[in-house]
């Protein structure tokens, strides 16, 4: 992968593809500039991920200008939320998470874009994962790692998002108990970021620790192959 973008500087509001280990290049927006005074985020931008509405701190080498890269990275992907992210970056690039709070760092100075009131049940929860980036050591994850049922991970299309209910007991699907109803039929959260402590993902139950692999590109392919083998086809669930 070319690292020619290593020295590129971004400004607030810039649209990018952001790369996190174990995840495809994801449509994102620069939300905050690096703050030299804060060691853990020096030279890192806070990025907002479209589709999942999570945030993470990433260095410039993991950021790729959107317009220049969309041919390369903007192809539909099986990860949940990715297709929605592609739509949002094109059609709704100023979207904010419900209940979003900016941190005290250099946040973007935008035209005052009114944001919706926090939705019940999805404005107060913290993200499930937080910590430093891949280069800085292990990711700290709030919840114990768990293998969720990944069958149906390919079913990313609207109209084909819910599993056939008898096959998936609620208890097994949502052991953490948080937002039980809302999360019942979810398969996986796509981009479980190092979520900033005071940011608020808008989706119920957002965040699951990214895989801790070393060779990320190979692992992505391996994971996709595994999903392909396990998951039923996207389009084979027309009736409940």
């Amino acid at each position: 992968m070319s690292r020619s973008n290593r020295q590129k500087e971004y400004k607030c509001g810039d649209l990018v593809f952001a790369k996190m280990k174990g995840y495809p290049h994801w449509p994102a927006r620069i939300d905050e500039m690096p703050e030299a005074a804060v060691k853990s985020t020096a030279n890192k931008y806070q990025v907002f991920f479209f589709g999942t509405h999570e945030t993470a701190f990433l260095g410039p080498k993991d950021l790729f200008p959107y317009e220049e890269s969309k041919e390369k990275f903007g192809k539909p992907n099986k990860r949940k939320g990715f297709s929605e992210g592609l739509w949002e970056i094109e059609n709704n690039p100023t979207v904010k998470a419900s209940g979003y709070q900016s941190s005290q760092k250099k946040s973007c100075v935008e035209e005052p874009e009114p944001e919706p009131e926090a939705a019940e049940g999805d404005g107060d929860k913290k993200g499930n994962a937080e910590g430093s980036s891949d280069e800085e050591g292990k990711l700290v994850i709030d919840e114990p790692a768990k293998e969720k049922n990944e069958k149906g991970a390919l079913k990313r299309r609207a109209g084909d998002l819910l599993e056939d209910s008898p096959k998936r007991p609620k208890e097994a699907e949502n052991p953490e108990g948080e937002e039980k109803e809302a999360a019942t039929l979810e398969v996986e959260r796509p981009l479980p970021m190092e979520v900033e402590k005071n940011s608020t993902p808008s989706e119920p139950g957002s965040g699951r620790g990214p895989p801790q692999e070393e060779e990320e590109e190979e692992d992505e392919e391996e994971e996709a192959t595994k999903e392909d083998a396990e998951a039923p086809g996207i389009r084979d669930h027309e009736s409940l």
């Epitope: 297709s83 929605e84 999805d122 609207a158 109209g159 998002l161 119920p204 027309e238």
Partner: antibody, heavy 120, light 106 residues
């Protein structure tokens, strides 16, 4: 700017086949992730989804009408065609087409609708 | 099929009011819910997608919430332009609309 426009007969007779065309601009149905849906609304009643076609020719139909519906696309003309067989007066409705993206974004852009009356 | 029920078919409110429109699904739809506005002239617009996300260009006085089977659309400061019929729609399993709630000014 995305626009969609429905066209077709305003009056059809019972038992006839209705053919409606959705002509759109501002997007292409050859683009991955894009779909077009048909929705109808009988006078004074609620919206009812009929059918969806995706960029890769995958189709979805309303189960209660599936046997009567066919949805096709002509990518080069930026058109989607819905045919509905064996029309009945209860099928009198305003028929809409709308653009949809493949994950979670709803019917983002709608046509103005075309009123079809089924009567002998 | 998943059924969507909007128990209130019509609603009267005053300008400036905070209005809430409810929608119930026949089963858990995991937040796969959109809200649409249909104006008296028949024009339909997407307002909110995925339960609480505001579609581009929609005023911030609109907000959505809910989980499981129960969802709601709130208009925080009713304006004359909000006179319309509002529909919920699930998209987890095919697509189904609610019966609509017609909003009128007192």
């Amino acid at each position: 700017q995305i626009t969609l426009k429905e066209s077709g007969p305003t009056l059809v007779k019972p038992t006839q086949t209705l053919t409606l065309t959705c002509t759109f601009s501002g997007f292409s149905l050859s683009t991955s992730g894009i779909g077009v849906a048909w929705i109808r609304q009988p006078p004074g009643k609620a919206l009812e989804w009929l059918a969806t076609i995706w960029w890769d020719d995958d189709n979805r139909y309303n189960p209660s009408l599936k046997s009567r519906l066919t949805i096709t696309k002509d990518t080069s003309k930026n058109q989607v065609v819905l045919t509905m067989t064996n029309m009945d007066p209860v099928d009198t409705a305003t028929y809409y087409c709308a653009q949809i993206y493949d994950y979670a974004v709803g019917f983002a852009y709608w046509g103005q609708g075309t009123l079809v009356t089924v009567s002998s | 099929d998943i059924q969507m029920t909007q128990t209130t078919s019509s609603l009267s409110a005053s300008l400036g009011d905070r209005v809430t429109i409810s929608c119930r699904a026949s089963q858990d739809i995991s937040n796969y819910l959109n809200w649409y506005q249909q104006k008296p002239d028949g024009t339909v617009k997407l307002l909110i997608y995925y339960t609480s996300r505001l579609h581009s260009g929609v005023p911030s006085r609109f907000s959505g919430s809910g989980s499981g089977t129960d969802y709601s659309l709130t208009i925080s400061n009713l304006e004359p332009d909000d006179i319309a019929t509002y529909y919920c729609q699930q998209y987890g399993k095919l697509w189904t609309f609610g019966g609509g709630t017609k909003l009128e000014i007192k």
